[in-house]
């Protein structure tokens, strides 16, 4: 069932006071505004789903047009530590310390967090990004350096009255943003402590969270435009699924991409695409307002239940898996990218998959919530869909187990 | 406006390397594949590989894949291509592009003379 | 990998006239090919996408068209600063190929 529980203290309908807090867009990330320190320093900071530190660009570099500066803060506290997180591409290092942290679109509270301050890094910041730092919100277990450094959200429950539990509402454009455009747009809501029932149509279906680390789901089954993929179901979670809003693209484990493209490019066979295409390499354009995004098929993700033998699914159009992308050299047409992508690491569940929905994150319930968002880009034919209840046979089969080895190599 | 800045001249010996650069501006770098292609008199354009910025996965060539290496530095917002154990044959003018559809934007030219 | 053949080396045209450049595809590339413009000493300059669409800013004087496995690259009323070679490339599958070039001289 969608579990629609009596409103609790907490989980009122509205908070209309951090609806529409994020900014940002699905390419360079979604970021919330936050307070650091003591007077209070202002940074944007990247909402990322993935990963479990907090941690701040702390020194001058290139990309950021700011920085915590802990010298001016009169509540930072060194704790004589330093972090190091290499990604499998480019990495960032810091000093590890605490402060005093809020978020002014948030819960009228403040919280003394670990910080990692950020000296050095490498293909971590983004050029005009206009974020500062990251959010990172899963799970100690993946925590660097290592689950004794308590994420931000623990602290945040554990300090104050704050439900454990937060949602995110992340609105794709559904078409190109220039720099003014980004910073003048809404990106979208991260709710935290609760759900804003204005941020979605339907009803919310919930998916346990398998282990907590990073969100891990299970999917169970795949379809392209309703035709199942048939696959071993193990082969969609090899070696885990995740939901990341700091991953741009819905990323597949090699096997489910192939199988999943090959589908795509039969149901869109009308037009020839190039293989770069495919690849995410050439971009593909129509005359503006032309999009034909009905040769394109819908991509379906049923997801394990809460319920035994019970499962839902959601569904995305090609309006969330085709990113908009703005050139110059062809700016008198609508283009776009590939944004399913192929991945070595499990499925990631990123923006691609997110902005089509609301989802909610409830850590005290150990589950993932799904809803149509009220601001995903759709078409008058096909809208983004959550649906059920289906009958699905041995889902637990569908997890697979990592061997047991250090998981402290995490390489994003 | 978009541009792509390529290194100046080299002149190597046979049996040295090289190491090209190709620097960007006017776009989001990491939003747009790099491609490096050869060209030598009468033997028009070849295309040797190519890099994504986001994360440096990289195409080849099968031809030119063990003379090749492409790599970037996003920091800079540049790419590298790094040509090994070269011979006359790889004597040529060598250009980065930009991908978007096609190759809408080039590199003003690198000339490479390899050379005793 | 797919051979893209200009068959002509060289042609001839005159300041005001209509010229069509040719370029055959070994096999189905569908309409994923683009045309270049590239004058002595400098680098190549797009011109053609999608076997029809003009990049920003390129006179419309240029017009591509073709598709499957024969295009055409047509400049009306040509100017004297179109003296220049013509590659055409398929970008449909790796490995990308060009044509091997038509140099159009003015008379």
């Known amino acids: 069932e969608t579990d629609e529980e009596p409103e609790e203290p907490g989980r009122r309908g509205s908070f209309v006071e951090m609806v529409d807090n994020l900014r940002g867009k699905s390419g360079q990330g979604y970021y919330v505004e936050m307070t650091v320190g003591s007077p209070p320093q202002t940074l944007n900071i990247l909402v990322d789903t993935g990963s479990s530190n907090f941690a701040v660009g702390a020194a001058p570099h290139p990309f950021l047009h700011r920085y915590y500066q802990r010298q001016l803060s009169s509540t930072y506290r060194d704790l004589r530590k330093g972090v190091y997180v290499p990604y499998t591409q480019g990495k960032w290092e810091g000093e590890l310390g605490t402060d005093l942290v809020s978020i002014p679109h948030g819960p009228n509270v403040t919280v003394r967090a670990n910080i990692a301050a950020i000296t050095e890094s490498d293909k971590f910041f983004i050029n005009g990004s206009n974020w500062e730092g990251i959010l990172g919100l899963a799970y100690a277990e993946i925590a660097r350096p290592d689950d004794s450094l308590e994420p931000f959200f623990d602290s945040l429950v554990k300090q104050t009255h704050v439900p454990n539990l937060f949602s995110l509402q992340l609105c794709g454009a559904g078409f190109p943003l220039n720099q003014s455009e980004v910073l003048a747009s809404v990106g979208g809501s991260m709710i935290i402590g609760g759900i804003d029932h204005s941020l979605y149509t339907g009803s919310l279906w919930y998916t346990p969270i398998r282990r907590e680390w990073y969100y891990e789901v299970i999917i169970v089954r795949v379809e392209i435009n309703g035709q199942d993929l048939k696959m071993d179901c193990k082969e969609y979670n090899y070696d885990k699924s995740i939901v990341d809003s700091g991953t741009t693209n819905l990323r597949l484990p090699k096997k489910v991409f192939e199988a999943a493209v090959k589908s795509i490019k039969a149901a869109s066979s009308t037009e020839k695409f190039p293989d770069g295409f495919w690849l995410g390499e050439q971009l593909v354009c129509w005359q503006a307002g032309t999009t034909p995004w009905n040769i394109f098929p819908v991509i379906s993700l049923y997801l394990m239940g809460e319920v035994t033998n019970q499962s839902f699914r959601i569904t995305i159009l090609p309006q969330q898996y085709l990113r908009p992308v703005e050139d110059v050299a062809t700016s008198q047409d609508d283009c776009y990218k590939f944004a399913i992508s192929q991945s070595s690491t499990g499925t990631v569940m990123g923006a691609v998959i997110m902005e089509g929905f609301y989802v909610v994150f409830d850590r005290a319930r150990k589950r993932i919530g799904f809803a149509v968002s009220a601001c995903h880009v759709h078409d008058e034919f096909r809208t983004a869909a959550v649906e059920g209840p289906f009958v699905t046979l041995d889902m637990e089969d569908c997890g697979y187990n990592i061997p047991q080895t250090d998981e402290s190599t995490l390489m994003t | 406006e978009v541009q792509l800045q390529q290194s100046g001249p080299e002149l190597v010996k046979p049996g040295a390397s090289v190491k090209l650069s190709c620097k960007a501006s006017g776009y989001t770098f990491t939003n747009f594949w790099i491609h490096w292609l050869k060209q030598r008199p009468g033997q028009g354009l070849e295309w040797i590989g190519m890099i994504d910025p986001s994360d440096s996965y990289t195409k080849y060539n099968q031809k030119f894949k063990a003379k090749a290496t492409l790599t970037v530095d996003t920091s800079s917002s540049t790419t590298y291509m790094h040509l090994s154990s070269l011979t006359s044959e790889d004597s040529a003018v060598y250009y980065c592009a930009r991908s978007g559809v096609a190759f809408p934007y080039w590199g003003q030219r690198t000339l490479v003379t390899v050379s005793a | 990998d797919i051979v893209m053949t200009q068959s002509q080396k060289f042609m001839s045209t005159s300041v005001g006239d209509r010229v069509s450049v040719t370029c055959k595809a070994s096999?189905?590339?569908?309409?994923?090919v683009a045309w270049y413009q590239q004058k002595p000493g400098q680098s190549p300059k797009a011109l053609i996408y999608s076997a029809s669409h003009r990049y920003s800013g390129v006179p419309d004087r240029f017009t591509g068209s073709g598709s499957g496995t024969d295009f055409t690259l047509t400049i009306s009323n040509v100017q004297s600063e179109d003296l220049a070679e013509y590659f055409c490339?398929?970008?449909?599958?790796?490995?990308?190929?060009f044509g091997g070039g038509t140099k159009l001289e003015i008379k």
């Open positions: 490339q398929q970008y449909n599958s790796y490995m990308y190929t």
């Open positions: 096999q189905n590339v569908g309409t994923n």
